[in-house]
C-alpha cells in the first residue's frame, strides 16, 4: 500500500513526462518567510558578498533579486532593525560599468535609489529604509530567495 | 474535478504540515542529468568561477560539490570531451590557506588529486581525467547541481 506522497511522486513524474513541469516549491521550507511568490531566508550571521552568494547557492537558492520598487518596499518591511544591512544579488560589473544582477540582467535605474558609489568591488545591500553600495568585502547579513510557485515548462539555459 | 497534480499539491502540503518536509525534487528538470541522488547541469557556455557560481545560484542550484573519489569518477564519466574543463564549487581560501567547498567545509586531501598550485585566486576545475587548479578568472564551463531526493526535516542554518 503506497502512501499518498509516494502515489503523488508517481503522479507528478507521469505528468511531467507530458508537460516537462518541475514540481517546484509548493510552500516555504521551515525558517523561510513567504513574500508573495517567493520564499526568503534572512541570515543571522555575517559574510562578505561572495560568501553570501555561495551560501545561498548551497541552499539551492539565489541571493535576493528585486524586480521593482514595490518588491523592495515589501522586503524592507520584513527588516526589523533600522541599521542592519543585508546583501542582495546585485553588484558592480567593471567591464560593463553598470550594476548587474546575478542573473545577468542590468539594473533598471528607476528601480532602486542607490546611496554610494558605483565602482569596482561594490555590491548592493538593503536596510529597512535604503539601498546602499558597500565594498563587497564588508561582512554583513544577506537574503536568499527561492521561487515559490511551480512553473510549467521552466527550463534553464545558460546565462 | 481536481487533476491528480492539484490533488497532489494538497496531499504534499498536508503531509508537510506534519513532517516539515520540503517537497524537494522528485526527478530532474529538463536538460539536467541524473547522477545518483543529484541532478547535474553541464554548461555549454564559459564563465569565470564567480559568474559560474552566480549562474548556478540563479538556477536555485549549487556549483558541483563532490563528496568522494567515487562521485568524482562517476561525474567525469559524463564528460564527453577530453580537453574540456568545468568549474566545481571548490576554491582556495587565502585566510584559511586551504581548499574550501562553497558550503564552508574544507577539502579532505585524499578526495581529489589536484594538479596545480594552492594559492590566492585559485579555483578548481575538473576534466574527463583530472582535477586542476586554475586562476578563478579563467573562462571555462561549469557544472551546477541540485539534490534530487526530498529530505525530511531539512533545515537551512547559516553557513
Amino acid at each position: 500500500q503506497k502512501s499518498s506522497i509516494e502515489k503523488c511522486s508517481v503522479d507528478i513524474q507521469q505528468s511531467r513526462n507530458k508537460t516537462t513541469e518541475r514540481p517546484g516549491l509548493l510552500n516555504c521550507p521551515i525558517y523561510w518567510q513567504q513574500l508573495r511568490e517567493k520564499c526568503l531566508l534572512f541570515s543571522h550571521t555575517v559574510n562578505p558578498w561572495n560568501n553570501s552568494l555561495a551560501d545561498c547557492s548551497t541552499k539551492e537558492s539565489s541571493l535576493l533579486l528585486i524586480r521593482d520598487k514595490d518588491e523592495l518596499i515589501h522586503t524592507q518591511n520584513l527588516i526589523r532593525d533600522k541599521a542592519i544591512l543585508f546583501w542582495i544579488g546585485l553588484n558592480f560589473s567593471l567591464s560593463e560599468k553598470n550594476w548587474k544582477w546575478i542573473n545577468g540582467s542590468f539594473l533598471n535605474s528607476n528601480d532602486l535609489e542607490i546611496r554610494g558609489d558605483a565602482k569596482e568591488n561594490s555590491c548592493i545591500s538593503i536596510s529597512q529604509t535604503s539601498v546602499y553600495s558597500e565594498y563587497c568585502s564588508t561582512e554583513i547579513r544577506w537574503i536568499c530567495q527561492k521561487e515559490l510557485t511551480p512553473v510549467r515548462n521552466k527550463v534553464y539555459p545558460d546565462s | 474535478q481536481k487533476s491528480s497534480i492539484e490533488k497532489c499539491s494538497v496531499d504534499i502540503q498536508q503531509s508537510r504540515n506534519k513532517t516539515t518536509e520540503r517537497p524537494g525534487l522528485l526527478n530532474c528538470p529538463i536538460y539536467w542529468q541524473q547522477l545518483r541522488e543529484k541532478c547535474l547541469l553541464f554548461s555549454h557556455t564559459v564563465n569565470p568561477w564567480n559568474n559560474s557560481l552566480a549562474d548556478c545560484s540563479t538556477k536555485e542550484s549549487s556549483l558541483l560539490l563532490i563528496r568522494d573519489k567515487d562521485e568524482l569518477i562517476h561525474t567525469q564519466n559524463l564528460i564527453r570531451d577530453k580537453a574540456i574543463l568545468f568549474w566545481i564549487g571548490l576554491n582556495f581560501s587565502l585566510s584559511e590557506k586551504n581548499w574550501k567547498w562553497i558550503n564552508g567545509s574544507f577539502l579532505n586531501s585524499n578526495d581529489l588529486e589536484i594538479r596545480g598550485d594552492a594559492k590566492e585566486n585559485s579555483c578548481i576545475s575538473i576534466s574527463q581525467t583530472s582535477v586542476y587548479s586554475e586562476y578563478c578568472s579563467t573562462e571555462i564551463r561549469w557544472i551546477c547541481q541540485k539534490e534530487l531526493t526530498p529530505v525530511r526535516n531539512k533545515v537551512y542554518p547559516d553557513s
Partner: antibody, heavy 122, light 108 residues
Framework: QVQLVESGGGLVKPGGSLRLSCAAS????????MSWIRQAPGKGLEWVSY????????YYADSVKGRFTISRDNAKNSLYLQMNSLRAEDTAVYYC???????????????WGRGTLVTVSS | DIQLTQSPSSVSASVGDRVTITCRAS??????LAWYQQKPGKAPKLLIY???ALQSGVPSRFSGSGSGTDFTLTISSLQPEDFATYYC??????????FGGGTKVEIK
C-alpha cells in the same frame, strides 16, 4: 554576561612597545566588527582601528598607521592591539568596542570595555 | 576626513528642562550618525544610532533627528542621571570614524 575586558596597559618609555588584549564573553564574538578607541586625559574620543569579523579587513587611523597592529583570535574570543614606537601623544585610556552587528563597516559601538590606561613617558 | 562640530560645548540646565545638542558634519553623511553619553571615569554608552534609532534599554526621553549634515540630540525632560558629556560620531563606511568634540551637560 555580555562584556569586554581590556588588559595590558601600563607605563612605557617613548619608543617602547605594549600589547593590549580584550577578552569578550557572553556573545558570538566571531560575528562582530571590533575596534579600539582611545581617549587622552581630559580630551574627546578618537577611533584607532577596526577589524572585520573574519579578520580579512583592517583599518587604522592615520595617527597610528605603521606603528599599531590590530588582530583577533575568534577561537579565544579575544581582540589585540600591538603598539610599537610609542609616543607621548599615545597616552590615553584605550577602549575595546563592539560594533552593532550586521551594520558592516558602519561602526556604531554598542558595547564598550572599561578601558585600560597607557602612559607613555620618560 | 569628515569633521563633526558639536554645539554648544557645554550647557547648564535644570532637572525637567528640555535640552537640545546639535552636531554638524563637514559633508553629507546620510543618516550614518550615532550619539553617546559618557560619565566621568566610565566608558561611553550608545544612545542613538542611524541618526534616530533608540538603542535598546535607553529611556524614551532621548531622541535623535536629522540627516545629511545637520543632526540633533534632544533630552525631553532632563533627569539627574543625564548630567554627562555627549558625543556624536559619524559612521560612513569609509574610515576614519570621527567623533564630535563633546557637549558637557552640567547642573544649573
Amino acid at each position: 554576561q555580555v562584556q569586554l575586558v581590556e588588559s595590558g596597559g601600563g607605563l612605557v618609555k617613548p619608543g617602547g612597545s605594549l600589547r593590549l588584549s580584550c577578552a569578550a564573553s557572553g556573545f558570538t564574538f566571531s560575528q562582530y566588527y571590533m575596534s579600539w578607541i582611545r581617549q587622552a586625559p581630559g580630551k574627546g574620543l578618537e577611533w584607532v582601528s577596526y577589524i572585520s569579523p573574519s579578520g580579512a579587513t583592517i583599518y587604522y587611523a592615520d595617527s597610528v598607521k605603521g606603528r599599531f597592529t590590530i588582530s583577533r583570535d575568534n577561537a579565544k574570543n579575544s581582540l589585540y592591539l600591538q603598539m610599537n614606537s610609542l609616543r607621548a601623544e599615545d597616552t590615553a585610556v584605550y577602549y575595546c568596542a563592539r560594533s552593532l552587528m550586521a551594520t558592516g563597516t558602519h561602526l556604531y559601538f554598542d558595547l564598550w570595555g572599561r578601558g585600560t590606561l597607557v602612559t607613555v613617558s620618560s | 576626513d569628515i569633521q563633526l562640530t558639536q554645539s554648544p560645548s557645554s550647557v547648564s540646565a535644570s532637572v525637567g528642562d528640555r535640552v537640545t545638542i546639535t552636531c554638524r558634519a563637514s559633508q553629507g553623511i546620510s543618516s550614518w550618525l550615532a550619539w553617546y553619553q559618557q560619565k566621568p571615569g566610565k566608558a561611553p554608552k550608545l544612545l542613538i544610532y542611524a541618526a534616530s534609532a533608540l538603542q535598546s534599554g535607553v529611556p524614551s526621553r532621548f531622541s535623535g533627528s536629522g540627516s545629511g549634515t545637520d543632526f540633533t540630540l534632544t533630552i525631553s525632560s532632563l533627569q539627574p542621571e543625564d548630567f554627562a558629556t555627549y558625543y556624536c560620531q559619524q559612521v560612513t563606511s569609509a574610515p576614519p570614524y570621527t567623533f564630535g568634540g563633546g557637549t558637557k551637560v552640567e547642573i544649573k
